[in-house]
């Protein structure tokens, strides 16, 4: 079964995927594809990295974190209902049949009608604190729990945190990452 993530129409969706490079700059090819992970690589590739850089991407799909440190989490910009579905993150670890593959299910909800400008946005829904643990079968998950209640003054802080990938670093520091080497 796939790990499920949610976002609203018009928001940016965040699909986490991490590994720990054996050494700084010693990168591993990673691909993201729309659809479950196939037998090799990714189908319907939307983004791909090699040992040095992002070498293929399509519009609206980008890596917001520091992929040189193994944060290959996918951001999908301005999502629509058509973005719903399963996405594959495949970490192509060198060796014989060493790939790590993770299927993440993205559920897009219709945008909420906001009756008053003071209404809090549901950042928990857009960026659930979930992470993918090491596993050779179907992706396993751990839930770190909902983000604490946030007030308006904290929203910009959280937005900056997400943009700066500190949340991703927090997830990585939890130890639930793919370690190579």
């Amino acid at each position: 079964s796939e790990v499920e993530y949610r976002a609203e129409v018009g928001q940016n969706a965040y699909l986490p995927c991490f590994y720990t490079p054996a050494a700084p700059g010693n990168l591993v090819p990673v691909c993201w594809g729309k659809g479950a992970c196939p037998v090799f690589e990714c189908g319907n590739v939307v983004l791909r990295t090699d040992e040095r850089d992002v070498n293929y991407w399509t519009s609206r799909y980008w890596l917001n974190g520091d992929f040189r440190k193994g944060d290959v989490s996918l951001t999908i910009e301005n999502v629509t209902l058509a973005d719903s579905g399963i996405y594959c993150c495949r970490i192509q670890i060198p060796g014989i049949m060493n790939d790590e593959k993770f299927n993440l299910k993205l559920v897009i909800k219709p945008a909420k009608v906001t009756p008053a400008p003071t209404r809090q946005r549901d950042f928990t829904a857009a960026f659930p604190r979930m992470l993918t643990t090491r596993g050779h079968g179907p992706a396993e998950t751990q839930t770190l729990g909902s983000l604490p209640d946030i007030n308006l003054t904290q929203i910009s802080t959280l937005a900056n945190e997400l943009r700066d990938s500190r949340l991703a670093n927090d997830l990585r520091d939890s130890g639930a990452t793919i370690r190579i080497g």
């Epitope: 090819p29 659809g35 479950a36 196939p38 037998v39 090799f40 690589e41 189908g43 319907n44 590739v45 090699d50 040992e51 192509q92 670890i93 060198p94 060796g95 014989i96 049949m97 060493n98 790939d99």
Partner: antibody, heavy 117, light 107 residues
Framework: EVQLLESGGGLVQPGGSLRLSCAAS????????MSWVRQAPGKGLEWVSA????????YYADSVKGRFTISRDNSKNTLYLQMNSLRAEDTAVYYC??????????WGQGTLVTVSS | DIVMTQSPSSLSASVGDGVTITCQAS??????LNWYQQKPGKAPKLLIY???SIVSGVPSRFSGSGSGTDFTLTISSLQPEDFATYYC?????????FGQGTKLEIK
Amino acid sequence: EVQLLESGGGLVQPGGSLRLSCAASGFTFSSYYMSWVRQAPGKGLEWVSAISGNGKSTYYADSVKGRFTISRDNSKNTLYLQMNSLRAEDTAVYYCARYYNTGFDLWGQGTLVTVSS
Amino acid sequence: DIVMTQSPSSLSASVGDGVTITCQASQDIYNYLNWYQQKPGKAPKLLIYYASSIVSGVPSRFSGSGSGTDFTLTISSLQPEDFATYYCQQASSFPPTFGQGTKLEIK
């Protein structure tokens, strides 16, 4: 012209070795996963092995694991299959094939490997 | 390993006929199903990928459908060059596996 051309097949005794080559042309070889697929005389298709574009990730069928080694030289646009400890059941036409978007979209003409005493 | 079962194993038809070949997977393979055509002494040729996407240059009389475990290849009006052996192949789970083939012969 986009094409794959295998070579290196022939007659070999059981327990012997052989190295197949597949020369690629007309496309960016290093960007593609490549595979070997075989077909025993009068039989169906059997996937044998695959390798990533950078050559660092390899994959094998259980029937050949530990005996066959796939490799590639991207500077020469060439794919290889080193076959050791050959058995009679390895007798087949061996095809190299390009893997793209979940399918084997380009195939060579094949090279026949016969394992017999 | 995922077992791919094709039916029928052989089929006789005439030019102009419509034929359907089925392929059943032993477990869910989403839409990761390919169809190949092979003529005697030749390499296989990819016709259909993702169960229903037709390869550029393949005549429109070929079509594929299905998802999950059950798939079909349909040739709407057979031409003389269509008589060959057809294979399905799953690309969902390791290792990739092929069906046993369906030989399409002239009646």
